[in-house]
């Protein structure tokens, strides 16, 4: 059955809730594109590999991104 869609964004719902960086398996930041006009942040949790879309405008999520990038810069030589 073909699907009619205006854009191809992945996130149907978003979360404003803070996420503990230690509980993160993966954090995908998908930039806006011709397929989806907004930035999408998809968190994959260590527990059962659950996936959740995060609100890029949320203060808690912005803090999470800072914490993750700081952690990455520590690891890189």
């Amino acid at each position: 059955v073909p699907l009619s869609r205006t854009v191809r964004c992945t996130c149907i719902s978003i979360s404003n809730q803070p996420v503990n960086p230690r509980s993160l398996e993966k954090l995908e930041i998908i930039p806006a594109s011709q397929f989806c006009p907004r930035v999408e942040i998809i968190a994959t949790m260590k527990k059962k590999g659950e996936k959740r879309c995060l609100n890029p405008e949320s203060k808690a999520i912005k803090n999470l991104l800072k914490a993750v990038s700081k952690e990455r810069s520590k690891r890189s030589p």
């Epitope: 059955v1 073909p2 699907l3 009619s4 869609r5 205006t6 854009v7 191809r8 964004c9 992945t10 996130c11 149907i12 719902s13 978003i14 979360s15 404003n16 989806c36 006009p37 907004r38 998809i42 059962k48 659950e50 996936k51 959740r52 879309c53 609100n55």
Partner: antibody, heavy 120, light 107 residues
């Protein structure tokens, strides 16, 4: 607690239009996707459409594509389904439902449903 | 398009275990949600993401997903469990997909 109050159903002639509404409360409406699902008399559940939290992404089932339009007003915390060019086979109970919130989409709270009868 | 196949009906003796299946190609690669629908009432989510139970749902309800079959199991079946049960997945090319539904009868 989550509440979804539906309105707008009724009897309508084939080819005419109808708009369903779903007023939401008890959760942050502007961060959740919303769905419409229908059930024809004696039949199973049939998904109709979904709209993303910001209204930017809309998916439709093939059976309603080009005839039905899903929309939302986040300031009013209300979901809509505009149904045009109605057919007898659109006769069903229509449910609005809140998205689960995680990926992949699911439906965790449902309205009580509103009956739409398309008949001449 | 992605399709989900459920048996039209399942019977279980009072107090016994009921098993409802949902078949789909490589369904184990998808997350399956289950809904209970009683006559005249709106559907209720009973299992989400294969095996998770909403807090209001009794522990007697459980789910699993492997290979080409997802399963809803209802332990110690009660008369109040009589209902239609639907499985559901999200498919990237077809959106929300429901199974045809299974009518559970408690004898």
């Amino acid at each position: 607690q989550v509440q979804l109050v539906q309105s707008g159903g009724g009897v309508v002639q084939p080819g005419r239009s109808l708009r369903l509404s779903c007023a939401a409360s008890g959760f942050t409406f502007s961060t959740y996707g919303m769905h419409w699902v229908r059930q024809a008399p004696g039949k199973g559940l049939e998904w109709v459409a979904v709209i993303s939290y910001d209204g930017g992404t809309k998916y439709y089932a093939d059976s309603v594509k080009g005839r039905f339009t899903i929309s939302r007003d986040n300031s009013m915390k209300t979901l809509y389904l505009q149904m045009n060019s109605l057919r007898t086979e659109d006769t069903a109970v229509y449910y609005c439902a809140k998205d689960l919130g995680d990926l992949p989409p699911g439906l965790d709270y449902w309205g009580r449903g509103t009956m739409v009868t398309v008949s001449s | 398009s992605y399709e989900l196949t459920q048996p039209p009906s399942v019977s279980v003796a009072l107090g016994q275990t009921a098993t409802i299946t949902c078949g789909g190609s490589s369904i184990e690669s998808k997350s399956v949600h289950w809904y209970q629908e009683k006559p005249g009432q709106a559907p209720v989510l009973v299992i989400y993401k294969d095996s998770n139970r909403p807090s209001v749902i009794p522990e007697r309800f459980s789910g699993s997903n492997s290979g080409n079959t997802a399963t809803l199991t209802i332990g110690r079946a009660q008369a109040g469990d009589e209902a239609d049960y639907y499985c559901q997945v999200w498919d990237s090319s077809t959106g929300v997909v429901f199974g045809g539904g299974t009518k559970l009868t408690v004898l």
